[in-house]
């Protein structure tokens, strides 16, 4: 999906208002220095591409974050503010709901969410630069 036509201001508002709080809650008990940020992004569409991938694509050691509250809110925000997102992405992420067996917060998942926080912060920074 090409995130170029999203309403970035509205996505930022939703992130700051609610998604960020859920990400921080998920990370509670860990320090920001516990993980190194290895994933980066260069502009707003690129940041959303990386956020989409890290939130909804299962990885070997973190099966799926897609059912977490922050992920559900991320999906709702992208569906609302990125025309065409739902048609191309929602069906693809439905399968991941079924893939998830048990809700275990592994260290690898914490690391992945730490990367997500970094990507979102980068998204906000690139937004500020543009204004």
């Amino acid at each position: 999906y090409d995130f170029t036509n999203c309403d970035f201001q509205k996505i930022e508002a939703d992130y700051l208002r609610t998604i960020s709080k859920d990400l921080i809650t998920y990370m509670s008990g860990t320090k920001s220095t516990d993980f190194n940020n290895t994933v980066s992004c260069s502009n707003r569409p690129h940041c959303l591409t990386e956020i989409q991938s890290l939130t909804f694509n299962p990885t070997p050691r973190c099966a799926s974050l897609a059912k977490e509250m922050f992920a559900r809110k991320t999906k709702a925000t992208l569906a609302l503010w990125c025309p065409g997102y739902s048609e191309t992405q929602i069906n693809a992420t439905q399968a991941m709901k079924k893939a998830r067996k048990s809700k275990v917060t592994t260290n690898k998942c914490l690391e992945q969410v730490s990367q997500l926080l970094g990507l979102w912060r980068r998204f906000i920074r690139t937004l500020l630069k543009k204004q």
Partner: antibody
Framework: QVQLVQSGAEVKKPGSSVKVSCKAS????????ISWVRQAPGQGLEWLGV????????NYAEKFQGRVTITADTSTSTAYMELSSLRSEDTAVYYC?????????????WGQGTLVTVSS | QSALTQPPSASGSPGQSVTISCTGS?????????VSWYQQHPGKAPKLMIY???KRPSGVPDRFSGSKSGNTASLTVSGLQAEDEADYYC???????????FGGGTKLTVL
């Protein structure tokens, strides 16, 4: 059963406010969009705004910005629409409608409608 | 004045086909594949008949079909039946600011 049940008819004076409720049952309230649509007597449909309870923040049609307030209470699966500074032209049937999950712009479930009459 | 333009009325005899048009612009119908159609009987709430241009929700007869060309969407009702007599409204997504627009409605009469 999957349904939206709205509050009863209201008669209001010009300049006052009205608050209509819409109680959802039979589905996960949070991730759907709840829109409000009105229909004046003998007229067409008009979209007022939407709220996704999961996100909690409403978005309004420009025409109603500043006059309409849409809220949602996830604990009771109820959405509310308040319209202020009422005038006679606001006399209409007000519907709440469910926007499909993550496809918020088409409405697959409607409330029964609430008639709001504005008259002095 | 509605942002989407529909003919005020349409009619046909039982068994015939009738097509209702809905004209918008590049900012709504022409820009997105997010057109839906609603049927409304007098005194009742609208009912979704078609979404995403041509998809039918379960329970809607296959006599109802939708299409789109450029800035115009169409609803076709084939094999008209008496119960099809109702008002029909088109709707389109119109971007993140306007969100949803409706047509003015078309009264379908089964002769």
């Amino acid at each position: 059963q999957v349904q939206l049940v709205q509050s009863g008819a209201e008669v209001k004076k010009p300049g006052s406010s009205v608050k209509v409720s819409c109680k959802a049952s039979g589905f996960t309230f949070g991730s759907y969009g709840i829109s409000w649509v009105r229909q004046a007597p003998g007229q067409g449909l008009e979209w007022l705004g939407v709220i996704i309870p999961l996100l909690g923040v409403p978005n309004y049609a420009e025409k109603f910005q500043g006059r309409v307030t849409i809220t949602a209470d996830t604990s009771t699966s109820t959405a509310y629409m308040e319209l202020s500074s009422l005038r006679s032209e606001d006399t209409a049937v007000y519907y709440c409608a469910r926007g499909a999950e993550y496809f918020y712009w088409y409405f697959d479930l409607w409330g029964q409608g609430t008639l709001v009459t504005v008259s002095s | 004045q509605s942002a989407l333009t529909q003919p005020p009325s349409a009619s046909g005899s039982p068994g015939q086909s009738v097509t209702i048009s809905c004209t918008g612009s590049n900012s709504d119908i022409g820009g997105y594949n997010r057109v839906s159609w609603y049927q409304q009987h007098p005194g009742k709430a609208p009912k979704l008949m078609i979404y995403e241009i041509s998809k039918r929700p379960s329970g809607v007869p296959d006599r109802f079909s939708g299409s789109k060309s450029g800035n115009t969407a169409s609803l076709t009702v084939s094999g008209l039946q008496a119960e099809d007599e109702a008002d029909y409204y088109c709707s389109s997504y119109a971007g993140t600011d306007t969100f949803v627009l409706f047509g003015g409605g078309t009264k379908l009469t089964v002769l």
